[in-house]
Interface confidence: low
């Protein structure tokens, strides 16, 4: 490697001395505290002498040295001033150091009221001090000087030193950001290194590093390592990269120049469409996954899925992967057909081959309907039970149920519905249902209630009185009854053509109507029964009511 720079030290350690004084220069090598062999000394870039590691000087100028084990040191400017007052700075001084300044008079005993200045402005709290400390100096062009009063017999004469430019050495070099590649391939790793060099005179100084893309901090922020490994680079990682180095005490911070990094893209190739379930045989209601993949391709890939006969794409996904999935939830019959997918990460999409998808339709909930000669089915009617699933791949087997009894089954080989016929009896009332099954799961219909009604038979009217002869004041009961017929039955009672009243019977035994007899109640009586399926009239019964006499006339 490159030999380390020699280090030039001063004794006494001030870079300015009075003319006539001597300053010792010591050449030190980092690899060995004392230089081995000859030391080359330079004054204002001219070889001064070849000697040991220490020389005495009395002349101003720029001094350098080098030894066998080290390269040429940085120049140190030593000033020998003829002035009465000088400002001295400790040497060496590095960026961020606190530097001691000393204002010295040739006759220092007779020098007093020393004041220190930076760029013409008095430094705070610097009055009448032998030495001051300037905190955290930087490599700027600040000029320092001091003033003092010199005793001259009985006079105090103000004197001013020459301006002093403190020789502040770089603690570490300006960083340079190095990337393992300035044009990485998308998805590939990259190493960024923030390179700098610490002054060999300050090996104990600890540095920390931070790397940036545009305004975003990379990694974990400040780190003792100058290196950052990025596992995978993407196009959005393209940009302006730079780094900062600072001492852990935050005293000195330096920033590198920006480096443009452009992430390169690998075009997609070998686009393949795969369908799950495998084979593209689906049952309606299942979820279909269309998996579009590429053999190669980097970065953000735009995947799209297409169906034959449809203008717009089924979906698009832009993501950083070689594979994307489109989920078609609960596929429908209309989802059957031919599909392809396309992938694009540059300019034009690459298409997959076509894949056919078939969709078998499970039966929908079937609907059970009754077909009968009239709205209110009656005993003897022929009832057709019709069960139909509006959707479902054939063949469909239909089963018919009355309550929980299976009445029979019927197949529909090419879809549609199926029928089952019943000749109704009074026992056929109740709940009917059907189910449909095409091998993809049976579906049950809602229950449908059927009421089979029985028309009323011709009623019989009976008159019941206390004695054989109806007499004024007797209580007469008229009883009307149909022996057959579905309830409720409405019974009507008549005297001649006048309606006496009606009574509804919800169970067997007929209905009765009571009359308190007067002479006007003589005449013909009849009744009628009706349950909504047609009224039936009884035969006429004649009643003769006698007056006050007790001998009774019989009922005819």
């Amino acid at each position: 490697g490159v030999a380390p720079k020699a280090v030039l030290l001063l004794n006494p350690p001030w870079s300015t001395a009075f003319k006539g004084e001597k300053v010792a220069l010591i050449c030190s090598s980092i690899s060995h505290s004392l230089a081995q062999g000859d030391t080359y000394w330079y004054h204002d870039e001219k070889l001064l002498k070849i000697k040991h590691d220490k020389i005495q000087i009395t002349e101003p100028g720029n001094y350098q040295c080098k030894t066998r084990g080290s390269s040429l040191s940085d120049a140190v400017h030593v000033e020998f001033s003829p002035d009465w007052l000088i400002l001295q700075a400790l040497h060496p001084v590095f960026e961020g150091d606190n530097v001691i300044l000393r204002c010295q008079g040739k006759d220092n005993k007779n020098t007093h009221q020393k004041v220190y200045y930076k760029d013409g402005k008095q430094l705070p709290n610097s009055y009448n001090l032998e030495k001051i400390t300037v905190n955290s100096v930087s490599r700027d062009n600040s000029k320092y000087h001091c003033t003092a009063y010199r005793k001259f017999y009985i006079l105090d004469i103000e004197v001013t030193s020459k301006p002093l430019n403190i020789q502040v050495q770089e603690l570490f070099l300006h960083p340079v950001l190095r990337a393992s590649s300035s044009t990485p391939i998308e998805g590939s790793p990259m190493t960024l290194t923030c390179e700098t060099q610490l002054s060999p005179q300050r090996p104990d100084v600890q540095l920390q590093f931070s790397l940036f893309r545009d305004s975003q901090t990379l990694g974990l922020g400040w780190s003792r390592s100058p290196r950052l490994q990025i596992p995978a680079m993407w196009t959005e990682d393209s940009g302006s990269y730079w780094c900062e180095v600072e001492t852990v005490t935050h005293s000195i911070k330096k920033r590198s120049l920006r480096s443009q990094i452009r992430v390169q893209r690998v075009p997609v190739s070998n686009v393949n469409l795969e369908i799950r379930p495998t084979g593209g045989q689906l049952i309606e209601g299942e979820n279909m996954v269309l998996i579009c993949s590429v053999a190669q391709g980097s970065g953000t890939v735009t995947f799209s899925w297409h169906k034959e006969g449809r203008v717009r794409s089924l979906g698009r996904k832009t993501q950083r992967s070689l594979l994307a999935e489109l989920h078609v939830l609960t596929v429908k019959e209309s989802d059957a057909g031919r599909y392809y997918c396309a992938a694009d990460n540059v300019h034009s999409p690459i298409l997959s081959t076509w894949i056919r998808v078939t969709v078998r339709i499970p039966v929908s909930h079937p609907v059970l309907t009754f077909r009968a000669p009239r709205a209110h089915t009656v005993v003897g009617d022929l009832l057709e039970l019709h069960c139909e699933s509006l959707r479902g791949s054939p063949p469909i087997l239909y089963r018919f149920y009355h309550e929980d009894v299976t009445l029979g089954n019927s197949s529909a080989p090419s879809g549609g519905g199926a029928s089952f016929n019943l000749s109704l009896t009074a026992e056929h009332s109740g709940n009917y249902s059907c189910d449909a099954d095409n091998g993809l799961g049976a579906q049950h219909s809602h229950g449908v209630s059927l009421r089979v009604t029985v028309p009323v038979s011709r009623p019989v009217l009976t008159l019941r009185a206390p004695g054989a002869q109806a007499v004024v004041g007797d209580l007469l009961e008229l009883h009307c009854e149909s022996l057959r017929g579905s309830f409720p039955i409405l019974y009507w009672f008549y005297h001649e053509d006048d309606t006496l009243g009606n009574i509804s019977a919800h169970s067997g035994g007929g209905a009765s109507f009571n009359l308190s007899l007067t002479t006007e109640h003589s005449g013909n009586y009849s009744c009628e029964a009706d349950n909504g399926l047609g009224a039936q009239h009884s035969k006429v019964v004649t009643l003769n009511v006698t007056g006050t006499s007790r001998n009774r006339t019989g009922l005819t």
Epitope: Q216, G219, L220, A232, Q319, R320, E325
Partner: antibody, heavy 116, light 108 residues
Amino acid sequence: EVQLQQSGPELVKPGASMKISCEASGYSFTAYIMNWVKQSRGKNLEWIGLINPYNGETTYNQKFKGKATLTVDQSSSTAYMELLSLTSEDSAVYFCARGLYWFPYWGQGTLVTVSA
Amino acid sequence: DIVMTQSQRFMSTSLGDRVSVTCKASQNVITNVAWYQQKPGQSPKALIYSASYRYSGVPDRFTGSGSGTDFTLTISNVQSEDLAEYFCQQYTNYPMWTFGGGTRLEIK
């Protein structure tokens, strides 16, 4: 629909180790970073670390180095977090969360109770 | 690490009110802040990212604002379903993400 399904609650003894799983579905598992977050009794959320399912590379919060180990199984689209040498301090709800910088998708959480 | 401070652990509000939840970063995080809502027994749900962008499906009564070190989540016209814990999260220094301590929104 993106879903992260985590394993059920665990009661473990101090000093033991255990592994939580997070099964991903509804997206390409290897294309997104998976993070793990701890929520202790005090409700504070702490980021534990992340794993890149594509290559298994991990980054941990310094605090959880040596405490958590993150792995993935690409074939089952599942991320795992193993918690080592458990103490009562590790009793918490642990979440997996998808996202590079912020977390739009979270698992339902796994309650870990460390008790003798 | 960057510390995210949610100074108000609890906040009381009335239904229909407007409420602001604040979060302070210990250093400049630009606009790299997300907000989450968490209801008891549930996982956090993303509301806001990049300080002010509403995540898809989030009602527009949720608004995020702020940059640098001070961030605010505002809920206008508070609904009963908004009563939850709200967390902020910074993501400036990849990937050392940190969360705020949370602010619980309660009914007065």
